[in-house]
Amino acid sequence: APVPPGEDSKDVAAPHRQPLTSSERIDKQIRYILDGISALRKETCNKSNMCESSKEALAENNLNLPKMAEKDGCFQSGFNEETCLVKIITGLLEFEVYLEYLQNRFESSEEQARAVQMSTKVLIQFLQKKAKNLDAITTPDPTTNASLLTKLQAQNQWLQDMTTHLILRSFKEFLQSSLRALRQM
């Protein structure tokens, strides 16, 4: 147990830490997810040559992965905290179906894929507490998600590998942009 302030603490292994602020918790959560994505990308790149492939555009046409744009208010020019927060939450909710797709795509990193999915849910909950205008957030339609998932799972092996690679890359980029924006808030 931490030693009360003013008492001798030389025998205590871990110093008394202040609880994390909401911003620190969000920052830490995003970095944790990014670590998970790195591990998944490593398996994907080891298994196929997708990471060096120049044929990404072929598969990207099939996907409608969330991306940050100027109008979302997350970039330094035209930064708008509330608009940006809505975009981040909406984007993460849109990524959920793609994270569902990833669940059966890994052999040695199956638990890591599940951890990324669950940690993203936790991140969404953290961010919702920060947002003032939840009414501006449109959640994905389950019927649309279901047909998208069916379509992705029906692709040939090469396209499925490419889709996996593109989801991980896009999710990483989206989280990195989110992290930069959230540090300005």
């Epitope: 179906v97 797709y101 849910k121 919702q128 389950p142 019927t143 998600n145 279901a146």
Partner: nanobody, 118 residues
Framework: QVQLVESGGGLVQAGGSLRLSCAAS????????VGWFRQPPGKVREFVGR???????NYADSVKGRFTISRDNNNNTVYLQMNRLKPEDTAVYYC????????????WGQGTQVTVSS
């Protein structure tokens, strides 16, 4: 699979209110999304609103500001509070649950009749 049972329908005057319930039984009820739909007489089923796992709600334009979806996780129940009802809200109301992000609405209730008289 989860069984969904709607209740709370009935006959109400225009301008009145009703609260529909959607109770789930079967297994632990923690769906990705619960949606409310309605089918007016002689028409196709239409979307009313939905609430996702994190509590975010979306509504059809025709009910925005009048209808509110809420949930009680302890009782495995989702509610549809309908205020300022209009005759055109007359329909059979259904709730549906999507168990996962990619599953679509994989459980449906049997529906409850709402009639709004002028």
């Amino acid at each position: 699979q989860v069984q969904l049972v709607e209740s709370g329908g009935g006959l109400v005057q225009a301008g009145g209110s009703l609260r529909l319930s959607c109770a789930a039984s079967g297994r632990t009820f923690s769906p990705y999304t619960v949606g409310w739909f309605r089918q007016p007489p002689g028409k196709v089923r239409e979307f009313v609103g939905r609430i996702n796992w994190s509590g975010i709600r979306n509504y059809a334009d025709s009910v925005k500001g009048r209808f509110t979806i809420s949930r009680d996780n302890n009782n495995n129940t989702v509610y549809l509070q309908m205020n300022r009802l209009k005759p055109e809200d007359t329909a059979v109301y259904y709730c549906a649950a999507a168990s996962q992000s990619g599953s679509g609405y994989d459980s449906w209730g049997q529906g409850t009749q709402v009639t709004v008289s002028s």
